[in-house]
Amino acid sequence: AITEAREEAKPYPLFPGPLPGSLQTDHTSLLSLPHTSGYQPALMFSPTQPGRPYTGNVAIPRVTSAGSKLLPPLAFKHTVGHIILSEHKDVKFNCSISVPNIYQDTTISWWKDGKELLGAHHAITQFYPDDEVTAIIASFSITSVQRSDNGSYICKMKINNEEIVSDPIYIEVQGLPHFTKQPESMNVTRNTAFNLTCQAVGPPEPVNIFWVQNSSRVNEQPEKSPSVLTVPGLTEMAVFSCEAHNDKGLTVSKGVQINIKAIPSPPTEVSIHNSTAHSILISWVPGFDGYSPFRNCSVQVKEVDPLSNGSVMIFNTSASPHMYQIKQLQALANYSIGVSCMNEIGWSAVSPWILASTTEGAPSVAPLNVTVFLNESRDNVDIRWMKPLTKRQAGELVGYRISHVWQSAGISKELLEEVGQNNSRAQISVQVHNATCTVRIAAVTKGGVGPFSDPVKIFIPAHGWVDHAPSSTPAPGNADPVLII
């Protein structure tokens, strides 16, 4: 027969197998055994139940010192097999054994789920000596039990290298359901199904799950834990939670917000960091991402000019860093710039447009009709050219840069001259005789140096060789000019 003592008068399934008894309690002793003064066990259990065969480990002692009779086998007395109690209650249980006095130094150890309990546990062993035997009661107490105290407890005793093991005492700590898996916040596509999971455990089991959406119950009848809720889709943000119910009451999970992915908000604070003649460096502050990571951004550039055709240039860039260098712009031009970014749902609106300007550019064409003369009497070279047809964007002409390279017998040196914008001729001193002088000219504005003209070569003979024929820039498509002597 299996005995039960319980907290509440309600049916509870008996535990099969090796559990000899069951007790559900939250308080006080059930019965007293003999005890030493000053020690009152808080919870004691029924001693041996007659008529039940014992299947645990026993030690069978050999012959006594008198050499006449065998001692009976040693075994722990039977005790309650199952204790059910609520979380945070105190519990005390024990095992007892009678040991013939011929044995010395008997020690009892407590084990839980196969591991010895050492250290800070409240275990007390009491000895009650008699003429022939000593009754030993080992008590184990736990204050304010927790779920982690659930398990199978046994006593072990070593005698003469033999190990005696008690029946297990199964402690079941019951409480409110405990979540092992709660729903997680998610960002989902509008009208697209997704799953939420909720799992909770007892004891006591079963644990039943209700789902709640925006304070309304989704399922009017519970599902057994674990539960997966397939949400058919949402059109607006919702908050979900799950309720876990068991016989002890209910526990509510955290509420999780399910957001609906949307297009991002437009970027803000588009600002100019640096302008050159042909590029503008901008940055922006990204808008709200719409619950979906940014993928990339688009920089839109319109030329602000009544004469322009109003076309928009689009430059695609990565979403991070929030910065982009717009290139291939015209010099000294005004532009309107906006930024839009996209996520998996789509493109944001364009940011507020900002105005930006490029600076003066360098000339885009070289001076024309470059001619070179050798003035032997003055030992210099005369250079003449025509002013290039520069565009307005290149800005004001500030002068010219003349490159002249002198080459003779393995020696080469380049010299640069700067001349003012009003000139269209220059003279340079002959640097080396019996050498070739190669001349190129570039126009200069505040925006920089333009391209150099095609090279014009003139041969500088040794003293006394005179040739007044000029070298000049060839017509387009001709080979490099050379001075024919």
């Epitope: 009208n191 789902w211 959406q213 925006n214 309304s216 989704v218 399922n219 009017e220 009848q221 519970p222 599902e223 809720l229 058919p232 889709g233 059109t235 919702a238």
Partner: antibody, heavy 118, light 106 residues
Framework: QIQLVQSGPELKKPGETVKISCKAS????????MSWVHQAPGKGLKWLGW????????TYADDFRGRFAFSLDTSVSTASLEINNLQNEDTATYFC???????????WGQGTLVTVST | QIVLSQSPAILSASPGEKVTMTCRAT?????MHWYQRKPGSSPKPWIY???NLASGVPARFSGSGSGTSYSLTISRVEAEDAATYYC?????????FGGGTKLEIK
């Protein structure tokens, strides 16, 4: 497949009692609530209430408290609706409907016409 | 309780036409369901949770809406669509149905 089969039509006199049954098959009966809906001639659908097939607890809409009673026989997967003290205005077709998540009536019985007439 | 108003009460359309019927709630609801009922048969589940077509429902049907305003649209009406369509809310008890929109085919 899932089916809800209702009992046949009933002709009753005012003051009498009628009991309509709804036998479910093809799913675990105690996993889903059972709602009752009626439609009076020329009118729309109206929800009477539902019964929790797991706990047996009924819930009634305000207009159907008192004379209406839901019950279960889980051993034969059957829900029943009993109407006491029948009145002429109880004449309607009564439907049982399995209630899924989000109060979606995914499966309906074929309907039982109750006629109350002197 | 949440009251659902369906409009129009009667909708007449020719085959091939696009039609839309609406269902308005007196307060915000989480989902709207739709059912089709033809004379002499029980209501058929038609659109679940605002926009999900029930099994066997033709793809020309669609549902949309949020908050207090929902609609059922048929992109190209066919003769077999003649029926009364009821909306039903999920959010709070009691469950309530709209008064129905009767679709007639010319």
């Amino acid at each position: 497949q899932i089916q809800l089969v209702q009992s046949g039509p009933e002709l009753k006199k005012p003051g009498e009692t009628v009991k309509i049954s709804c036998k479910a098959s093809g799913y675990t009966f105690t996993s889903y609530g059972m709602s009752w809906v009626h439609q009076a001639p020329g009118k729309g659908l109206k929800w009477l209430g539902w019964i929790n097939t797991y706990s047996g607890v009924p819930t009634y809409a305000d207009d159907f408290r008192g004379r209406f009673a839901f019950s279960l026989d889980t051993s034969v997967s059957t829900a029943s609706l009993e109407i006491n003290n029948l009145q002429n205005e109880d004449t309607a077709t009564y439907f049982c409907a399995r209630e899924d998540n989000w109060a979606w009536f995914a499966y309906w019985g074929q309907g039982t016409l109750v006629t109350v007439s002197t | 309780q949440i009251v659902l108003s369906q409009s129009p009460a009667i909708l007449s359309a020719s085959p091939g036409e696009k039609v839309t019927m609406t269902c308005r709630a007196t307060s915000s609801v989480g989902y709207m369901h739709w059912y089709q009922r033809k004379p002499g048969s029980s209501p058929k589940p038609w659109i679940y949770a605002t926009s999900n077509l029930a099994s066997g429902v033709p793809a020309r049907f669609s549902g949309s809406g949020s908050g207090t305003s929902y609609s059922l649209t048929i992109s190209r009406v066919e003769a077999e669509d003649a029926a009364t369509y009821y909306c039903q809310q999920w959010s709070s008890n009691p469950r309530t149905f709209g008064g129905g929109t009767k679709l007639e085919i010319k």
